[in-house]
């Protein structure tokens, strides 16, 4: 059965910061998603071999991709509290196939001991929720990010 | 359509205190990075200073020509920016544009802008 | 804090010309620029970010490029409505800094 390998589990860093999310599968995808979970889960980009990526409000003009759908990795910068959340890679495949997750905890650069990953990877039923709305213009439809096939919960 | 509506603006005696308003319309203004930019007469874009949302600490980041003497803050329950101008100086006149700043640093979306002149 | 400094300030060219517009930084910016268009009496609008990322709505005859100190405008065939003033903005920290301005005219 197709999967989808997720890296790392768990990274804090501080504010202004970068981090890079690692989503890997063995082929025969559309294309990948990459979500922040939360009572409101959030598309951030959507990659897909030979078509522009696209990417929410928000994150624009600070994430970067680099390797291919198969094997991406995802590179967001200039990070600010309200990213600090759960970022999980949904593979578009005949069934959707979901990464464990990446928990990314930002911190005040003073605060740098409060907040520590533990070892364990993030479940799914136990994630901090990420700050209600995203990016800017009010209408949705402005981060014009495909709609996944089927439902987008998950499972 | 997200539109910036500044007001505030007129002419202002030197050491004058206005305070310039600026309305947001259709944004999520809560989770919006709001700054000031100002053009003089005939002149360049300088950066004033910027607020962040509450979300990311909302603080506030000033240019060096207006630190200790210009205040921003927002109003989130009513949409709405401010920025306070005290002892203002005859190198303070302007057009001052409210700004929507990205999270990345640059500026998607801008007011029309309002003048203030400061002149005895 | 960051200099950014544009060439040329004016320049004349004709409808249909392909118009190169230059701007430098101080010290490296990585890609950390855009570029804005402004027209008399108007409020700046954006056209390109992170050196060469069109926004959305701008016409693709507009291009960016360039990274660490050098960063460049193109507008490959020149419009009636591209007469205006251009200016390159740098947001490498958090203290931005724009270019003086280029002023593209009619020759």
């Known amino acids: 059965a197709q999967e989808v390998q997720q890296s790392p589990h768990c990274t804090t860093v501080p504010v202004g910061a970068s981090v890079n999310i690692t989503c890997s599968t063995s082929g025969g995808l559309r294309g990948i998603y990459l979500r922040q979970l939360g009572p409101q889960p959030q598309d951030i980009i959507y990659y897909e071999d030979g078509v522009v990526p696209t990417t929410d409000r928000r994150f624009r003009g600070r994430i970067d991709f680099s390797g291919s759908q198969d094997n991406l990795t995802i590179t967001m910068h200039r990070l600010q509290l309200s990213d600090t959340g759960t970022y999980t890679c949904q593979a578009i495949t005949e069934v959707n196939v979901y990464g464990s997750g990446t928990l990314v905890l930002v911190t005040e650069e003073q605060s740098q001991g409060w907040h520590r990953c533990s070892d364990a990877p993030p479940r799914a039923s136990a994630l901090p929720a990420p700050p209600t709305g995203s990016a800017l213009p009010d209408p949705q439809t402005a981060s014009a990010l495909p709609d996944p096939p089927a439902a987008s919960a998950l499972p | 359509e997200v539109q910036l509506v500044e007001s505030g603006g007129g002419l202002v005696k030197p050491g004058g205190s206005p305070r310039l308003s600026c309305a947001a319309y259709g944004v999520t203004f809560s989770n919006a990075w709001m700054s000031w930019v100002r053009q003089a007469p005939g002149k360049g874009l300088e950066w004033v200073g910027r607020?962040?949302?509450?979300?990311?600490?909302?603080?506030?980041d000033y240019a060096a020509p207006v630190k200790g003497r210009f205040t921003i803050s927002r109003d989130d329950s009513k949409n709405t920016l401010y920025l306070q101008m005290n002892s203002l100086k005859t190198e303070d006149t302007a057009v001052y544009y409210c700004?929507?700043?990205?999270?990345?640093?640059?500026?998607?979306?801008w007011g029309q802008g309002t003048l203030v002149t400061v002149s005895s | 804090d960051i200099q950014m400094t544009q060439s040329p300030s004016t320049l004349s060219a004709s409808v249909g010309d392909r118009v190169t517009i230059t701007c430098r930084a101080s010290?490296?910016?990585?890609?950390?620029l855009a570029w804005y268009q402004q027209k008399p009496g108007k409020a700046p609008k954006l056209l390109i970010y992170?050196?060469?990322s069109l926004e959305s709505g701008v016409p693709s005859r507009f291009s960016g490029s360039g990274s660490g100190t050098e960063f460049t405008l193109t507008i490959s065939s020149l419009q009636p409505d591209d007469f205006a003033t251009y200016y390159c903005?740098?947001?490498?920290?958090?203290?931005?800094?724009f270019g003086q301005g280029t002023k593209v005219e009619i020759k």
């Open positions: 700004t929507i700043e990205a999270v990345a640093g640059h500026f998607d979306y």
């Open positions: 010290q490296s910016i990585s890609s950390w």
């Open positions: 992170k050196a060469s």
């Open positions: 607020i962040k949302s509450k979300t990311d600490g909302g603080t506030t």
């Open positions: 903005q740098q947001y490498n920290n958090y203290s931005p800094t």
